[in-house]
């Protein structure tokens, strides 16, 4: 039975040219996290973090995606095209698969604030 929940940073905004941390957290379960996949709005792969093999960063993003902190992902040199949904997929044992969603808005404004409160989707 899947008892866990994914908490995410929810809806966040960040400045064009800046960076943002995408973070999900699995709680309320003792399941072992074996792999976390990070995907972009069009479901294209950004990165994989395998518990035993480490990180795989999609090659086209390697110059502006940094692994971590933890199981999260840091997206750098943001462009307006980065606006959209991001998904974390947690493969766990024995529970199975959990999925979280984050919406990132990249703002032109120099006063853009990076809001990053955790929330349950």
């Amino acid at each position: 039975m899947m008892t866990g929940t994914i908490e995410t940073t929810g809806n966040i905004s960040a400045k064009k040219g800046g960076s943002v941390i995408l973070q999900c957290h699995l709680s309320s379960t003792m399941a072992q996290v074996t792999q976390v996949n990070w995907e972009q709005h069009d479901h294209s792969l950004l990165a994989i973090r395998n518990a035993e093999l480490g990180w795989h960063i999609y090659p086209a993003f390697k110059d502006r995606v940094a692994p971590g902190p933890g199981l999260g992902l840091t997206l750098q040199s943001l462009t307006m095209n980065d606006t959209g949904e991001y998904f974390c997929t947690y493969h766990t044992y024995p529970d199975g698969t959990y999925r979280g969603r984050i919406f990132l808005e990249v703002l032109e404004s120099s006063v853009a604030e990076h809001s990053a409160r955790f929330q349950i989707p």
Epitope: L45, N50, A51, L53, P59, A60
Partner: antibody, heavy 119, light 107 residues
């Protein structure tokens, strides 16, 4: 065109070390992880480890962990695999293989380097 | 370690035949499975990754299916250049492991 060109065949004595090179071209070397896989004569494939050429960080198969070292030279776009304390059962073809776009599989392979361990 | 078994270990077939190779895995690997083709004296060639995605340049007569612990590689109409050994590999944990191979030869 992606190419992985490996160094030539080696004959080594038991207890010695061997260092195999793999020169990459046709793509951005630091953007793709590199794996090493070996194949004993008439046998299947055995994964040895992988490296991130950008950071130099590596992961190894526990079976080889104490004997294998995978390194890179970013300037020459070359990956290296060194295996120490060689024994006769290390006689095999050693392959470098580039990691694929979408995970930990390998999409391009070198031509292989035959390592023979014999007294 | 994740254990991989393949069946059959070898098969004889004719040009035009439909060929199916099975790979069974000791634990759930979701869809993280690749298939490779290897000809004698040559390096392995990637055919399929993520269980069903055809690698670039691979003919459409090849197809992969399955998830969890049971996977299949199908060649819809065997061609002369398809006689080779086929290996499955999980790409989900350390160590990455390969199946023992299935040799496809001419009947």
């Amino acid at each position: 065109e992606v190419q992985l060109v490996q160094s030539g065949a080696e004959v080594k004595k038991p207890g010695a070390s061997v260092k195999v090179s793999c020169k990459a071209s046709g793509y951005t070397f630091t953007n793709y992880y590199m794996h090493w896989v070996r194949q004993a004569p008439g046998q299947g494939l055995e994964w040895m480890g992988r490296i991130d050429p950008d950071s130099g960080g590596s992961k190894y198969n526990e079976k080889f962990k104490s004997r294998v070292t995978i390194t890179v030279d970013k300037l020459s776009s070359t990956a290296y695999m060194e295996l120490s304390s060689l024994r006769s059962e290390d006689t095999a073809v050693y392959y470098c293989a580039r990691e694929g776009h979408y995970g930990f599989y390998s999409d391009y392979w070198g031509q292989g380097t035959t390592v023979t361990v014999s007294s | 370690d994740i254990q991989m078994t393949q069946s059959p270990s070898s098969l004889s077939a004719s040009v035009g035949d439909r060929v199916t190779i099975t790979c069974r895995v000791s634990e759930n690997i979701y869809s993280y499975l690749a298939w490779y083709q290897q000809k004698p004296g040559k390096s392995p060639k990637l055919l399929v990754y993520n269980a069903k995605t055809l690698a670039e340049g691979v003919p459409s007569r090849f197809s992969g299916s399955g998830s969890g612990t049971d996977f299949t590689l199908t060649i819809s109409s065997l061609q002369p250049e398809d006689f080779a050994t086929y290996y499955c590999q999980h790409h989900y944990g350390n160590p990455l492991t390969f199946g023992p191979g299935t040799k496809v030869d001419i009947k």
